[in-house]
Amino acid sequence: HGTELPSPPSVWFEAEFFHHILHWTPIPNQSESTCYEVALLRYGIESWNSISNCSQTLSYDLTAVTLDLYHSNGYRARVRAVDGSRHSNWTVTNTRFSVDEVTLTVGSVNLEIHNGFILGKIQLPRPKMAPANDTYESIFSHFREYEIAIRKVPGNFTFTHKKVKHENFSLLTSGEVGEFCVQVKPSVASRSNKGMWSKEECISLTRQYFTVTN
């Protein structure tokens, strides 16, 4: 087999709700023909399942083969470098990939103008890959919370707020002129999952009309 290939230095998952991506760092001095083999182990079924024989990218979408993540004990993944007939030792993820590793996001934040106030609606994620019964609110059925950041123009500051426990909120804005921009970061009080700030959604108030911008 000649000289042994070095193993990928690190392998890890980066996941959002039903978007489970395995990443790895390349081996040093890889050639144009170097590719990577990916295998997956489901806890409770103690055998490795080959997922990809030769990926030339440094990530692999494992969502389709980990759809039961939210009802399972989790997964481990491993990756090795392959170059022709040579291959490296496996590098295994350091931690169990479970629901705890999923970064929480919101689908979007909708802002609507009403008589004297802005109504904000937090839309929960609705990934296409998710099975019909596996909604965000069914999996995280209790203790959903949201940190809300509001920025006003004119003005120099962004104001963050204590976590709120509802998906709807109101901003009292009668007579206001300017732009209000909102971001939301979800969490679940009973869990340790990280949350990610949403894209900023803005609404402009004038005396005559309003516009929504991203």
Epitope: G116, F117, I118, I148, I150, R151, K152, P154, G155, F157, T158, F159, T160, H161, K162, V164, K165, H166, N168, F169, S170, L171, L172, T173, S174, G175, E176, V177, F180
Partner: nanobody
């Protein structure tokens, strides 16, 4: 840095009145909503009242409606809370806080994380 300073607290008999003021140094209040919050001993901080930067929107907690009035004087860079018909249960430390807008969730005024004053004590007792 934003510095908010409350004043006007004190000891008052039930049924009496107090006027609290919130002033800012090195910070123009007129761009921002100002909320009044209070914290009684052993209780969580709760929203009392809020006024939008334009003064066109106000919020009052059910417990103070008809008794408290919030107003702002942007020329003097102050926001005031006139408190009438005070009750013993109004006893608390009162804080003002700056916000981009008065935010209400399920009928409750939501506390901002930053830009708070140090508080002024209000005691209602005979």
């Amino acid at each position: 840095d934003v510095q908010l300073v409350e004043s006007g607290g004190g000891l008052v008999q039930p049924g009496g009145s107090l006027r609290l003021s919130c002033a800012a140094s090195d910070f123009t209040l007129d761009y921002y909503a100002i909320g009044w919050f209070r914290q009684a001993p052993g209780k969580e901080r709760e929203g009392v009242s809020c006024i939008s930067s334009s003064g066109g929107s106000t919020y009052y907690a059910d417990s103070v409606k008809g008794r408290f009035t919030i107003s702002r004087d942007n020329a003097k860079n102050t926001v005031s809370l006139q408190m009438n018909s005070l009750k013993p249960e109004d006893t608390a430390v009162y804080y003002c806080a700056a916000d981009a807008a008065c935010m209400v969730v399920a009928g409750t005024l939501i506390l901002p994380d930053d830009y708070w004053g140090q508080g002024t004590q209000v005691t209602v007792s005979s």
